[in-house]
């Protein structure tokens, strides 16, 4: 019967007794940077090319001569997970292996860099189809490792890496912390984060998604027909590399940004038990388990968006946090969040020719996060319209006044340390969908965008008294581009998007002594592109 | 091993006259930084990746590496260039004493230097 992990990543429409999704990644070359591999194993024989690249440190304190089968074990298993005949994800994908880890599974940053350069050189000498690079390894945070990954990604290569097995914040490790790399955490058959002895999968904002990573059956180097079950974030990353190969085979022209957005879009949402993660990491960690698209039809009709969290600002009074979108993505909205509730809002700024989301800490605050909503929208042109604090009881308002521009997000920023309560509650005037409304003492910023066929609407869910969480979701066919709190009083911790749902968090009412007059609303801006819908209909 | 060292000594002698007049100071206002792994057991002191500024011409990597070797030799230190990067980042990998870091950080075109560290199968 089908192994649990292959079943988990397979949409129901493919599920039979066998895992046989169409187009097995045959147009894609997957580079594996790992230990040596047993290329004559029946699972991978004929689909693996062992390059002559080797850059490994000497084994330490070993008691006997190197035995191939023992040195090949890690790499062979992963090669099998990516493209093995029986237990592989992308059975048609070709594999090229580079040896950067020794028999003890140890390598160096420098050796891996030389390996990445070898791949780039090969790509320049002989350009082929789409390339996926699998890095099932981790070291401490490394500026140079991350920079090299960024360069390779900008050259059109898709990099997939293990989040790490340290039960820790993935941002403390490389290449897991590189924003351009697709970083994968591990879950088990119960959709729980994987525990590995006293440690387990890494987590946090640097993880893009999770994938099966416990009790994964794959090729064993003990013999050419042997199999073994293994666990780890390497195994999880190998699943995503396989899924990426499948997607790129179906749509070879996909950019890294498009591929990442699709991986997120087709993932199973909200199935992971977040209680396993440290409390402060739960909101930052994506609750996504990778899966193949339900069919090979082009998903171009969809307006894809994802949420990107910044690093924590730190507690100093003037501290700020910045969230950035990937190279080919557009920042459509910006929000902020603080666990203490002490923040001074957020705004969209230009930085190096790109829009970024900056959040501001307040005096006595423990720090803030900036949260960017990053979307794929062809031919988009955005600007920010700002209204200074109105001072009047009506609150501050700003709208998109340029012809053809629609509102994609609202941000507010204030200089005062503590916004007073807002009585009576401010609710949006009817018939003005292109308007942002906020506290009278705050500057309000409207993100206004123009793109062919782009239409947006505001959806609001208000409650008369503060609750710990208020949510509002976009309907099917619409994508959440903006999420903000209304009116942004002091008990609001912030707003952020989770998939297609806008979440507004408030302080625990029991501890703040809030009055029932302090209303709070979650405001979602939901968009779709008629242009993309038409384009996909023409394709089909 | 001896052959490599022999070649290296010849190279240094050939470069001395060319390099002697060069200042150790970096270009005006530039400050290169040094980075190392926060996890102490994973550090690999003695091997360093010298990363040059983004816009650096590819021939500059070799030239900077040679300059470092020459200046190190003048101070009585042996260095070994293990690899020169061209296709991803401009820079080079060097085996040298940590005593030379201050000198290396002052070289023209240097953006930052990172001490090598371990990575592990996951």
């Amino acid at each position: 019967s089908i192994p649990w992990n292959l079943e988990r990543i397979t949409p129901a429409r493919y599920r039979a007794d066998e895992y046989q999704p169409p187009k097995g990644g045959s147009l894609v070359e997957v580079y594996l940077l790992d230990t040596s591999i047993q290329s004559d194993h029946r699972e991978i024989e004929g689909r693996v090319m062992v390059t002559d690249f080797e850059s490994v440190p000497e084994e330490d304190g070993t008691r006997f001569h190197r035995q191939a089968s023992k040195c090949d074990s890690h790499g062979t298993h992963l090669a099998g997970v990516v493209s093995g005949r029986d237990a592989g994800v992308a059975k048609g994908a070709g594999l090229r292996s580079l040896r950067v880890l020794n028999c003890q599974g140890k390598g160096t940053v420098s050796g891996t860099l030389i390996g990445l350069e070898f791949i780039r050189k090969s790509q320049l000498v002989q350009p082929v189809g789409p390339l996926v690079v699998l890095l099932p390894l981790a070291g401490g945070y490394s500026r140079v490792f991350n920079a090299a990954c960024q360069r390779l990604a900008r050259a059109g290569v898709v990099l997939v890496t293990a989040a790490g097995n340290f039960r820790d914040d993935a941002c403390l490790y490389s290449p897991a912390s590189a924003p351009e790399v697709i970083t994968v955490g591990a879950t088990n058959a119960q959709d729980q984060p994987v525990t590995l002895g006293t440690l387990g999968t890494n987590f946090g904002r640097c993880v893009d998604l999770f994938a099966p990573g416990e009790d994964i059956i794959g090729a064993s180097s003990d013999c050419s027909t042997c199999f073994v079950s293994r666990s780890g974030t390497s195994q999880a990353a190998a699943h995503v590399a396989g899924i990426a190969a499948m997607m790129l085979s179906a749509e070879p022209e996909l950019t890294l940004a498009e591929l990442r957005q699709r991986l997120i879009h087709f993932s199973a949402k909200d199935v992971i038990n977040e209680a396993w993660f440290p409390e402060d990491q739960r909101v930052l960690t994506p609750n996504l388990v990778a899966a193949l698209p339900p069919s090979t039809h082009r998903a171009g009709w969809q307006l894809f968006c994802r949420t990107v969290w910044s690093a924590h600002s730190g507690p100093t009074r003037m501290a700020t946090a910045v969230a950035r979108c990937a190279q080919d993505e557009e920042l459509l909205s910006c929000s902020s969040f603080s666990r203490s509730g002490k923040r001074r809002g957020e705004r969209i700024e230009a930085q190096g020719g790109k829009r970024v989301c900056r959040a501001h800490n307040a005096f006595g605050g423990e720090g803030v996060y900036a949260i960017a909503r990053c979307c794929l929208l062809p031919q988009v042109n955005c600007s920010v319209h700002t209204a200074p604090p109105a001072g009047a009881s009506m609150g501050t308002r700003v709208h998109c006044h340029q012809q053809g521009h629609v509102l994609t997000g609202c941000s507010s920023h204030w200089e005062v340390e503590d916004l007073g309560t807002h009585k009576p509650p401010v609710l949006r005037p009817r018939g003005q969908p292109n308007q942002c409304v906020g506290h009278r003492e705050a500057s309000i910023h409207a993100s206004c965008c123009h793109a062919p066929g782009l239409e947006c609407k505001v959806k609001e869910h208000g409650i008369p008294a503060p609750q710990e969480q208020v949510i509002v979701a976009c309907e099917d066919g619409w994508t959440l581009t903006g999420c903000s709190a209304l009116p942004g009083t002091s008990h609001v911790l912030g707003a952020y998007a989770v998939d297609n749902t806008c979440v507004v968090r408030s302080r625990d009412v029991s501890t703040t002594g809030s009055t029932s007059e302090e209303a709070v609303a979650a405001v979602a801006i939901c968009c779709r592109s008629r242009h993309l819908v038409q384009a996909s209909q023409e394709l089909q | 091993q001896e052959d490599e060292d022999g070649d290296y000594e010849e190279l240094v002698l050939a470069l001395r006259s060319e390099e002697d007049g060069l200042a150790d100071a970096p270009e005006h206002g530039a400050t290169a930084t040094f980075h190392r792994c926060a996890k102490d057991p994973w550090r690999l002191p003695g091997t360093y990746v010298v990363v040059l500024k983004e816009e650096t011409h590819r021939s500059q990597s070799e030239r900077t590496a040679r300059r470092l070797q020459a200046q190190a030799a003048r101070r009585g230190y042996l260095t070994k260039i293990l690899h020169v990067f061209h296709h991803l980042l401009p820079g080079f990998l060097v085996k040298m004493s940590g005593d030379l870091l201050e000198l290396a950080l002052k070289l023209p075109h240097v953006d930052y230097i990172e001490e090598d560290s371990s990575v592990f199968a996951q």
């Epitope: 140890k106 002895g197 079950s229 666990s231 | 102490d40 057991p41």
Partner: antibody
Framework: EVQLVESGGGLVQPGRSLRLSCTAS????????MHWVRQTPGKGLEWVSG????????NYADSVKGRFTISRDNAQNSLYLQMNSLRAEDTALYFC????????????????????WGQGTTVTVSS | DIVMTQTPLSLSVTPGQPASISCRSS???????????LYWYLQKPGQPPQLLIY???NRFSGVPDRFSGSGSGTDFTLKISRVEAEDVGLYYC?????????FGGGTKVEIK
């Protein structure tokens, strides 16, 4: 439920051999270092040997080095201890034990701890 | 090899009363990774040892919170805040900073 079951113990004459087996269930066997530990009334608990997941890294106590061989078969979820040239002082209750630490080759895990033990199998070396 | 010395050899405790066992290593068990590799086990009569505490002070899953570990470097202590009848048996400390793994001689805990 994680379980380890030892077998193969018995009475054997000095100089002869014995092979102990340990069958594991309830966990992904290949993810962990495995160990043999013995217990004698006189010497208490004594670590005998340990083996990494892919058998690359193998260690022995000095008292058994050259006489005992540890091995594993991940496909069968089994751990073995081949004991040759047995001596009277090898008489003990032999436990198979799972390591607490997820093992990836030796990678970043240099340290060990034993979290699950089998019930043990008795080896008596006597003429 | 690292020598582990446990005191006392035996301990007789009234139920509900606290108990404390000491363990001293012949060299520091602090690793450069910041962790200290000291473990505590309980072996009940007729059973294999069971893990109580790992890395000095972390309780293993399922271990009651009346058990706690402390110490650093070379000196370590296992405390039982209120001894219960089921806590009788032999208590061992073990170091794993260096192979071979070595155990203390054991402390026998019995109920008065």
């Amino acid at each position: 439920e994680v379980q380890l079951v030892e077998s193969g113990g018995g009475l054997v004459q000095p100089g002869r051999s014995l092979r102990l087996s340990c069958t594991a269930s309830g966990f992904t066997f290949a993810d962990y270092v495995m160990h043999w530990v013995r217990q004698t009334p006189g010497k208490g608990l004594e670590w005998v040997s340990g083996i990494s997941w892919n058998s690359y890294s193998i260690n022995y106590a000095d008292s058994v080095k050259g006489r005992f061989t540890i091995s594993r078969d991940n496909a069968q979820n089994s751990l073995y201890l081949q004991m040759n040239s047995l001596r009277a002082e090898d008489t003990a209750l032999y436990f198979c034990a799972k390591d607490i630490t997820y093992d990836l080759l030796t990678g970043y895990n240099y340290n060990y701890g034993l979290d699950v033990w089998g019930q043990g199998t008795t080896v008596t070396v006597s003429s | 090899d690292i020598v582990m010395t446990q005191t006392p050899l035996s301990l007789s405790v009234t139920p509900g009363q606290p108990a404390s066992i000491s363990c001293r290593s012949s060299q520091s068990l602090l690793h450069s990774d910041g962790k200290t590799y000291l473990y505590w086990y309980l072996q009940k009569p007729g059973q294999p040892p069971q893990l109580l505490i790992y890395e000095v002070s972390n309780r293993f899953s399922g271990v009651p919170d009346r058990f706690s570990g402390s110490g650093s470097g070379t000196d370590f202590t296992l405390k039982i805040s209120r001894v219960e009848a089921e806590d009788v048996g032999l208590y061992y400390c073990m170091q794993s900073i260096q192979l071979p793994l070595t155990f203390g001689g054991g402390t026998k805990v019995e109920i008065k």
